[in-house]
Interface confidence: medium
């Protein structure tokens, strides 16, 4: 067995499903989006060994379902996917990946063949650990790329200062696949913030331990840089679900600090 | 095992319009894209478009944009191509055939003859 | 959209013959597919993904190739492959061909 967890029950339906209703948030010049064609580029992977799965056997399925993400509206993150996808609330206040449609799609999904069969494994999939080039991990490599490549404006990034390694993981999908694929033609800027949970150690915040070297990597790279603590609106949504948490006592947006390039 | 059967050949005047069948069985019709792919005598492969029979989307090649139109009827596993203000340039062999991207399962082919 | 240009056009080879077929894009795919087609026939998949074999495609057959240039490759021509084979991009659409190699009788 494989250390990760296997296909998701309903593959085919939940990526279809996601795919139709996705398609109604899209521009009308942008919507005539062929889902069955987009699964069918998409199941190219799971015709394939799970450990021999590239970032470039989703090309086809990223070119039949990319689109256009709105300048500034571009959120990156680590270590707070469920905190990013309730603030962008379905592309209304940001697009992060999950937001786009070939990542809408796949968002919690887990997929692979069998090693030695063409069903799928619904017992369990490899990670990174059992193998590099595994499906599920391939698949977030190529869609982080075009993402990245995607984006203009003011770059979000939101990152987890209560995580116990610290709010920037020096190798992770951030790191390694995002930021070298910027365009830096195309970016006026980028805003980190740096989330801490609610009742949470206060591990890293701006200008601390990894995010002094985010800081110095995006500066070397020429993006002017930007880092708040706790920005408030997130700060806000995090405390419905803590409301009489002294965290959480409304205090005057000065609160919040801030530190500029 | 996938079986695509088209219609017969056509013989149509200059002007008019022809709509020709593709009828799918040996497999589930509604999750597969079926393709257009025009070929005319003696040369190559022209890709025209394919619809999603699951929703009924299509996606054309800009050069068949305006000239084909296609269509799906899920209750007969058929798909439809109708091709407008036919020109000696639309006699061709049209196939109809299964995939996203490559084609494993084709249609014998449609010869459609356009006289003036 | 990717042209793609096969070469050579034709090519005269008698049985028993190694025979290689290129193809080039216009611009970089991720995988080649190869199609065998006799006269009035439709298209028979014989490469998928660049190198796979397509079911009951002979062994003869081969391909390889990245990026831009791709082959297919016939170890021994048998009397069956006399025919015209063509090359399909998978990267983009629309879906583009080449415009065909005839292999005929020497």
């Known amino acids: 067995r494989w250390r990760g967890e296997g296909t998701s029950a309903h593959l085919r339906d939940i990526f279809l499903g996601r795919c139709a209703e996705y398609r109604a948030l899209l521009s009308p010049e942008q919507r005539n989006k062929n889902c069955t064609a987009i699964w069918e580029a998409f199941k190219v992977a799971l015709d394939k060994d799970p450990c021999s799965v590239l970032p470039s056997d989703y090309d086809l399925f990223i070119n039949l379902s990319r689109h256009s993400i709105p300048r500034d509206k571009s959120l990156f993150w680590e270590n707070s996917h469920l905190l990013v996808n309730s603030f962008a609330d379905n592309t209304r206040r940001f697009m992060p990946l999950s937001d786009v449609l070939y990542g809408r799609v796949a968002d919690f999904l887990s997929w692979c063949r069998q090693k030695n069969d063409s069903g799928l494994d619904y017992q369990s999939c490899p990670t990174s650990e059992d193998c590099e080039n595994n499906p599920v991990d391939s698949f977030w490599k190529r869609a982080s790329i075009q993402y990245s490549k995607d984006s203009s404006g003011v770059i979000h990034v939101m990152l987890n200062g209560s995580e116990p390694t610290g709010a920037y993981p020096i190798k992770g999908f951030f790191a390694d696949y995002e930021i070298p694929n910027l365009q830096k033609e195309k970016i006026t800027r980028i805003e980190i913030w740096v989330m801490h949970e609610i009742g949470g150690p206060n591990v890293e915040s701006c200008g601390e331990g990894s995010m002094k070297v985010l800081e110095k990597r995006l500066k070397d790279m020429g993006f002017q840089y930007s880092c708040i603590n706790d920005y408030r609106p997130v700060k806000l949504l995090q405390c419905v679900d803590h409301s009489t948490h002294p965290d959480c006592a409304l205090k005057s947006a000065a609160a919040a600090t801030q530190r500029k390039a | 095992q996938a079986y695509l059967q088209q219609s017969g050949p056509e013989l149509v005047k200059a002007g008019a319009s022809v709509k020709m069948s593709c009828k799918a069985s040996?497999?589930?019709?509604?999750?597969?894209?079926i393709n257009w792919v025009k070929q005319s005598h003696g040369k190559s492969l022209e890709w025209i478009g394919n619809i999603d029979p699951y929703y009924g989307t299509t996606y054309y090649n800009q050069m068949f944009t305006g000239k084909a139109t296609l269509t799906v009827d899920q209750s007969s596993n058929t798909a439809y191509m109708q091709l407008k203000s036919l020109t000696s340039e639309d006699s061709a062999v049209y196939f109809c055939?299964?995939?996203?991207?490559?084609?494993?399962?084709w249609g014998q082919g449609t010869l459609v003859t356009v006289s003036a | 959209d990717i042209q793609m240009t096969q070469s050579p056009s034709s090519l005269s080879a008698s049985v028993g013959d190694r025979v290689t077929i290129t193809c080039s894009a216009s611009?970089?795919?991720?995988?080649m597919y190869w199609y065998q087609q006799k006269p009035g026939k439709a298209p028979k998949l014989l490469i998928y993904d660049t190198s796979n074999l397509a079911s009951g495609v002979p062994s003869r057959f081969s391909g390889s190739g990245s990026g831009t240039d791709y082959t297919l490759t016939i170890s021994s021509l048998q009397p069956e492959d006399f025919a015209t084979y063509y090359c399909?991009?998978?990267?983009?659409?629309?879906?583009?061909f080449g415009q065909g190699t005839k292999v005929e009788i020497k």
């Open positions: 055939a299964r995939g996203s991207a490559w084609f494993p399962y």
């Open positions: 611009s970089s795919v991720t995988y």
């Open positions: 040996g497999y589930s019709f509604i999750e597969y894209t």
């Open positions: 399909q991009q998978w990267s983009n659409y629309p879906l583009t």
